[in-house]
């Protein structure tokens, strides 16, 4: 029977800068029941505080609700593991809520095949930002990424969409059923999970165009921009 091993706070995430959760990995338990407690203070402060909520984030977590979250403060936190034989402490982790945002996936992904009479057909997709994110405050700039693949293909084709919430793609395989997903990330922060897949059947008479992909920006008043495969490669994110 031994004191517990050193725990590690391995991740802190916020969906929207208004709340956040941190998770730790226990060290070895020393063969005895072990209690874990997270304490923190804010930079510039010596008042030590205890985790306000060990429940919401699941096992080995501490959740900071709205009233405990301040965007303008760096949190300094540590986990203490205690059993009958002694204690051990994690390393201190410095957390700035601005840099740990991982939004929920974008919502309402709609995908349509457009076949205008005067132009080549294209795949058009549109989505909304996640509900928890308030873009009107100016606290957030969300960037988007799209991925798609034929249903039976192994590899995804990925496109960076910038701040747009609309995207157009040429060069698809006619007659194929495609899966399309979108994800987002704040300017400082982490990519969200991918949105649930939306399926779209590409008509057999869809005209292939391997040379170029067409993207349109809402922000440019409908003006269309031709982007070559080479340019797109620079925006490729995995």
């Amino acid at each position: 029977q031994l004191p517990p091993g050193k725990p590690e706070i391995f991740k802190c995430r916020s969906p929207n800068k208004e709340t956040f959760t941190c998770w730790w990995r226990p060290g070895t338990d020393g063969g005895l029941p072990t209690n874990y407690s997270l304490t923190y203070h804010r930079e510039g402060e010596t008042l030590m505080h205890e985790c306000p909520d060990y429940i919401t984030g699941g096992p080995n977590s501490c959740h900071f609700g709205k009233q405990y979250t301040s965007m303008w403060r760096t949190y300094v936190m540590m986990v203490n593991a205690t059993n009958q034989m002694g204690s051990s402490f994690s390393d201190e982790l410095y957390v700035d809520v601005t840099y740990i945002v991982q939004p929920d996936p974008p919502l309402e992904l709609t995908v349509e095949v457009k076949q205008p009479e005067d132009r080549k057909p294209y795949l058009w997709m549109k989505w909304s930002p996640p509900t928890l994110i308030d873009l009107k405050t100016g606290w957030f700039t969300l960037l988007y990424e799209i991925r798609l693949k034929p249903e039976k293909a192994a590899e995804w084709e990925t496109h960076f969409a910038g701040q747009q919430t609309e995207f157009k793609i040429l060069s698809l395989h006619p007659g194929q059923k495609y899966l399309v997903q979108v994800r987002c990330k704040p300017d400082h922060g982490y990519w969200s999970a991918w949105s649930p897949a939306t399926f779209i059947q590409i008509p057999s008479d869809f005209i292939m165009n391997d040379e170029q992909k067409l993207i349109s920006e809402e922000d440019l008043g409908g003006e269309q921009k031709l982007i070559s495969e080479e340019d797109l490669h620079h925006h490729h994110h995995h």
Partner: antibody, heavy 118, light 107 residues
Framework: EVQLVESGGDLVQPGESLRLSCTAS????????MNWVRQAPGKGLEWVSY????????YYVDSVKGRFTISRDNAKKSLYLQMNSLRADDTALYYC???????????WGQGTMVTVSS | DIQMTQSPSSLSASVGDRVTITCRAS??????LAWFQQKPGKVPELLIS???TLQSGVPSRFSGSGSGTYFTLTISSLQPEDIATYYC?????????FGGGTKVEIK
Amino acid sequence: EVQLVESGGDLVQPGESLRLSCTASGFTFNSYEMNWVRQAPGKGLEWVSYISSSGGTKYYVDSVKGRFTISRDNAKKSLYLQMNSLRADDTALYYCARLNGVDVFDIWGQGTMVTVSS
Amino acid sequence: DIQMTQSPSSLSASVGDRVTITCRASQDIFNYLAWFQQKPGKVPELLISAASTLQSGVPSRFSGSGSGTYFTLTISSLQPEDIATYYCQRYNSAPLTFGGGTKVEIK
């Protein structure tokens, strides 16, 4: 309604003891850090003591260290201040005050009066 | 311990006047500073936290500013209901010291 109600104030002689209580309602008491703040008649506010949400961390103003003990019973939603070796300069209205998530006193009770006089 | 010095200790001003109260900390407290209003015979009420964040329901004529060691509370247009004693308080470390208070009266 979020509320704090103090009780236990009394007139006592120097050297005697007193225990103040504060009962909380309308909020999740065990999630909040609590404090005692006092105000001598006609004087300003003086912070007395702090206790963390589980009771594991306590702080006191120098003038009461070794004489006063702060404690809490989360099951009873109650905060206590055990006051021993009372002195005339402890005479004051004692408030219990909740510390919000960003460390500011956001909710105060109405206070309970402690008078130490021979 | 960090001392909090408020000035003036009292002031008298006319309705509609702009009133400024200052609070100095003996050491840098970043912006861990709150302002409270205590009306005669009443419980203190939080006006401002983090030096400049106005609490919900507090009239916009109240504002706070400052960082480090020097802070101010301003009432842009004094109203009869603002008769009270105002306290600054630091909250970055124990003891959670209050300033001595500023009593505001109407001329």
